[in-house]
């Protein structure tokens, strides 16, 4: 009996048209739903002239429905039993499940000024920049509305600069109609434990954006991982969120829905510093921000996004050192609402429900030649919003899953 | 003091790509944009476009949109300039030009890399 | 593309004399930030150009106080008070406020 249902997983959870697992894997049949709170800065005018710590409090959530469009230009290639596509990104706002409106203003860092500075490090260029970010009234801390944070606006320091540069600034700009990948991932048909794992991004097998095995692409999307999955795994994915491959571990059994799945959590070793996690040596990119690679918990990914500085870490720095948090006020970190899970159902590898949670930082440092910098006595990595993404399987789909699957099992 | 290093010229096929170095010296490379000029024989000057090598970002004429891929190696301070689908017209001196800090000037040159396409 | 139109082409002058160059572009050259991008360039036979002028009247570091940058909008002339045997070459005035940038077609200043 055991082998006969071994042999149905088998079948059905490669990626290839007919098996139950393609259908989900082109188009997720599961609502998935991204909810950002932002740092609405309180102190603004303290921050800049007096390098006070800057006070911040959450609001939200705002919450869009993303992960609603079809995988495009899926192609299977039979030689080397892979599978490639590209996946389109897309967000729809949901007033019913928001606090306010896309129209919201929240008083935030100036992303271009923070990104320009640190970018052009020259000190004759900064004294040009300075100019412009004058004469365009532009300050160290703007006010901007929901639409215009998270998806783009036109800056007006930046349409002053004489160079052809993007004068459109955004956290997620630009997505609508843009796509991530291409993804190349192995469809299982030649060896089921591979299913789903990626084997190429972007048409490389590394990312050139770290040293050594950090810049490798491991593991899957976290959307499903090969089947039977074991308690003692530790589940290897990549997150182009976050510009790296990361790795969750088993946490507790859950019932969802009746369906019994395995909790994978990431554990905070993943965000610990090289003092005690020697692993992540190479996710420390430079020595002054991060204290000679003693500080944890915030990842810069500014190489993967043109030198902007970006930081990423969990919401409310949970897992990071009290050094980076300590300039900042009125943050309340706790696991339960700010880490990230997968719930996965063993027998299948599927992933039925997750939490994905992430927060957008930051740095803004010093600047002799930036009026609006000069103050500042210290370096802050500004935390600028946090999202929650989540999906669970519905409970039409967990009723067939239940007979299909487990049903069949138990 | 600041110097700009160009390669060797080029004699070459229509159709065929080149990649012409400008190695630089003398200043910190990845802190000022690193433009590439054309003259055509006897003739003025053309913008091509242009790289910052602190992150690689680029600016174009669109005019040499597809003709040319502007890229830099960091370690080596060397910014290199690569022309594709060579014709006769892509004949001319190429300049690679420092710029002079973000006032769209160019204060240093390179000696220039003679290209002649020719079957 | 912003054009730019140098004149004369050719400037034939004595040694010690005054020369003039004009440079005139198809629309302002004032840049929304409140600039002017127009620089001049001198390339002698076989060499690379070397800035002279930036920014309409800016001298770029070791030129001669006999050359003189002015001019605004659409109209800029470069002056040399004396001219002397090593500023013989081309010149050409360039345009940084509208991207593609561009450069005029150059005045060849020679000796009469």
């Known amino acids: 009996g055991d082998l006969l249902i071994q042999k149905t997983i088998k079948k059905q959870v490669v990626l290839e048209e007919g098996t139950i697992a393609f259908k989900n894997w082109v188009k997720t049949g599961t609502e998935v739903y991204r909810q950002f709170w932002i740092f609405d800065v309180q102190n603004p005018q303290e921050v800049m002239m007096n390098s006070s710590n800057i006070q911040v409090k959450q609001r939200g959530p705002y919450t869009y429905r993303v992960r609603f469009l079809a995988k495009e230009n899926v192609t299977q290639d039979a030689e080397d039993n892979t599978v490639s596509f590209l996946q389109p990104n897309g967000a729809i706002f949901e007033p019913s499940l928001s606090v306010g409106t896309e129209a919201d203003n929240f008083t935030v860092l100036n992303l271009a000024v923070a990104a320009a500075s640190h970018i052009y490090q020259n000190q004759f260029v900064q004294m040009i920049l300075n100019s412009l970010i004058n004469k365009s009234k532009s300050s160290m801390f703007q006010v901007r509305t929901l639409r215009e944070l998270l998806w783009g606006y036109r800056d007006p320091f930046l349409s002053l600069v004489p160079y052809p540069v993007t004068t459109t600034v955004g956290l997620f700009y630009p997505y609508n109609n843009t796509a991530d990948g291409v993804y190349k991932v192995f469809n299982g048909k030649d060896n089921i434990s591979k299913v789903a794992i990626i084997d190429t991004y972007k048409g490389k097998r590394n990312l050139s954006y770290w040293e050594s095995h950090c810049d490798m692409i491991n593991g899957t999307d976290a959307a499903s991982f090969p089947p039977f999955v074991e308690k003692s795994q530790v589940l290897q994915f990549f997150s182009s969120d976050i510009c790296r491959s990361i790795y969750a571990v088993f946490e507790s059994d859950v019932n969802l829905k009746g369906i019994p799945v395995y909790r994978f959590v990431l554990p905070s070793k993943a965000f610990a510093s090289p003092v005690e996690n020697p692993d992540n040596y190479c996710f420390c990119t430079e020595k002054i921000i991060s204290k000679n690679c003693t500080s944890y918990g915030v990842l810069d990914i500014s190489k993967c996004k043109e030198g902007r500085p970006v930081y990423i870490s969990l919401p409310h720095f949970l897992y990071a050192s009290p050094d980076v948090s300590e300039p900042i006020d009125g943050l309340n970190p706790n696991e339960e609402e700010h880490r990230t899970y997968l719930d996965i159902e063993p027998i299948t590898g599927f992933t039925l429900q997750f939490a994905k949670r992430l927060q957008v930082n930051l740095l803004v440092k010093p600047s002799e030649k930036i009026q609006v910098l000069k103050n500042l006595k210290r370096n802050y990595i500004v935390p600028i919003l946090w999202l929650n993404e989540t999906g669970t399987i519905g409970d039409e789909k967990a009723n067939m899953f239940r007979s299909q699957v487990t049903g069949k099992i138990n | 003091d600041v110097q700009l290093q160009e390669s060797g010229p080029e004699l070459v096929k229509p159709g065929a790509s080149v990649k012409i170095s400008c190695k630089a010296s003398?200043?910190?490379?990845?802190?000022?944009?690193m433009h590439w000029v054309k003259q055509s024989h006897g003739k003025s000057l053309e913008w091509i476009g242009y790289i910052y090598p602190y992150n690689g970002g680029t600016g174009y004429n669109q005019k040499f949109k597809s003709k040319a891929t502007l890229t830099v190696d960091n370690s080596s301070s060397t910014a290199y300039m690569e022309l594709r689908s060579l014709t006769s017209e892509d004949s001319a001196v190429y300049y690679c030009?420092?710029?002079?800090?973000?006032?769209?000037?160019?204060?240093?040159w390179g000696q220039g890399t003679t290209l002649t396409v020719s079957s | 593309d912003v054009v730019m139109t140098q004149t004369p082409l050719s400037l034939p002058v004595s040694l010690g004399d005054q020369a003039s160059i004009s440079c005139r572009s198809s629309q302002s050259l004032v840049h929304s930030n409140g600039n002017t991008y127009l620089h001049w360039y001198l390339q002698k036979p076989g060499q690379s150009p070397k800035l002279l002028i930036y920014?309409?009247?800016n001298r770029f570091s070791g030129v001669p106080d006999r050359f003189s940058g002015s001019g605004s909008g659409t109209d800029f002339t470069l002056k040399i008070s004396r001219v002397e045997a090593e500023d013989l070459g081309v010149y050409y005035c360039f345009q940084g406020s509208h991207v593609p940038w561009t450069f005029g077609g150059g005045t060849k200043l020679e000796i009469k």
């Open positions: 003398g200043y910190t490379f990845t802190d000022y944009n």
């Open positions: 030009a420092r710029d002079g800090g973000y006032d769209v000037y160019f204060d240093y």
């Open positions: 920014k309409v009247s």
